[in-house]
């Protein structure tokens, strides 16, 4: 049984205390009330750095 904070969830997922397992953050778009969505970033990181002149 995973102790929260000891082993991070895979990228794109977050720990659910209600299910005691990592859950896919992609589902938070459909159901944002899920407890694990608090641990999901609001938006994925940009795939490249924006360079300004």
């Amino acid at each position: 049984e995973r102790v929260p904070g000891t082993t991070p969830c895979p990228r794109g997922s977050s720990w659910s205390a209600d299910l005691d397992k990592c859950m896919d953050c992609a589902s938070c778009r459909a159901r944002p009330h899920s407890d694990f969505c608090l641990g999901c970033t609001a938006a994925p990181p940009a795939p490249f750095r924006l360079l300004w002149p």
Epitope: H33, S34, D35, F36
Partner: antibody
Framework: EVQLLESGGGLVQPGGSLRLSCAAS????????MMWVRQAPGKGLEWVSY????????HYADSVKGRFTISRDNSKNTLYLQMNSLRAEDTAVYYC?????????????WGQGTLVTVSS | DIQMTQSPSSLSASVGDRVTITCRAS??????LNWYQQKPGKAPKLLIY???SLQSGVPSRFSGSGSGTDFTLTISSLQPEDFATYYC??????????FGQGTKVEIK
């Protein structure tokens, strides 16, 4: 065969306490979230409480918050509901149910229920 | 809490009839909608989950459809054992799951 068997119901006076049990068999109990649902005589279904597989996370309906406590003993394959400060409106058949392995999506097996009657 | 409203509250039908029960949510719940059957003195039984997925062991005459706020449970050809009360349940706004008030299917 999956089985959930509730016990502990009965007649209790207002303000009294009861502890319900739900004995699970036919499946590995520890990975599953569980919940209690009640049904007042002649009425519909009302969700009461939810507990995570480890027991570390619990949730309650507003109508029972602060009075009821859900818990589980995974070594005994048993779910509990401690009910304190009981009121007449708590009179109902109480069912335990097994959750699926995704987030709160459905409850696929239910016990036969145990009747709690709160009356003086 | 999200309110679930079923219609009709009761209906009379004959064996072989096609029966449709509707469930409306007070706000969008995507496809997080389940249907249960309950017979008198018995526990509820899961029929349909995620709006349209048939639970294992449930006869194929039962089907579910809908998304957002409007959902339907259809029994294509009513059988004697189908006379019961049916409940919808939303699992979108967790943990406060809520049930519809029920639809009683009676013999005409």
């Amino acid at each position: 065969e999956v089985q959930l068997l509730e016990s502990g119901g009965g007649l209790v006076q207002p303000g009294g306490s009861l502890r319900l049990s739900c004995a699970a068999s036919g499946f590995t109990f520890s990975p599953y979230p569980m919940m209690w649902v009640r049904q007042a005589p002649g009425k519909g279904l009302e969700w009461v409480s939810y507990i995570s597989p480890s027991g570390g996370s619990t949730h309650y309906a507003d109508s029972v918050k602060g009075r009821f406590t859900i818990s589980r003993d995974n070594s005994k394959n048993t779910l509990y509901l401690q009910m304190n400060s009981l009121r007449a409106e708590d009179t109902a058949v109480y069912y335990c149910a097994r959750g699926g392995d995704t987030y709160f999506d459905y409850f696929d097996y239910w016990g036969q229920g145990t009747l709690v009657t709160v009356s003086s | 809490d999200i309110q679930m409203t079923q219609s009709p509250s009761s209906l009379s039908a004959s064996v072989g009839d096609r029966v449709t029960i509707t469930c409306r949510a007070s706000q969008s719940i995507s496809s997080y909608l389940n249907w249960y059957q309950q017979k008198p003195g018995k526990a509820p039984k899961l029929l349909i989950y995620a709006a349209s997925s048939l639970q294992s062991g449930v006869p194929s005459r039962f089907s579910g459809s809908g998304s957002g706020t409007d959902f339907t449970l259809t029994i294509s050809s009513l059988q004697p054992e189908d006379f019961a009360t049916y409940y919808c349940q939303q699992s979108y706004s967790t943990p406060g799951i809520t049930f519809g008030q029920g639809t009683k299917v009676e013999i005409k």
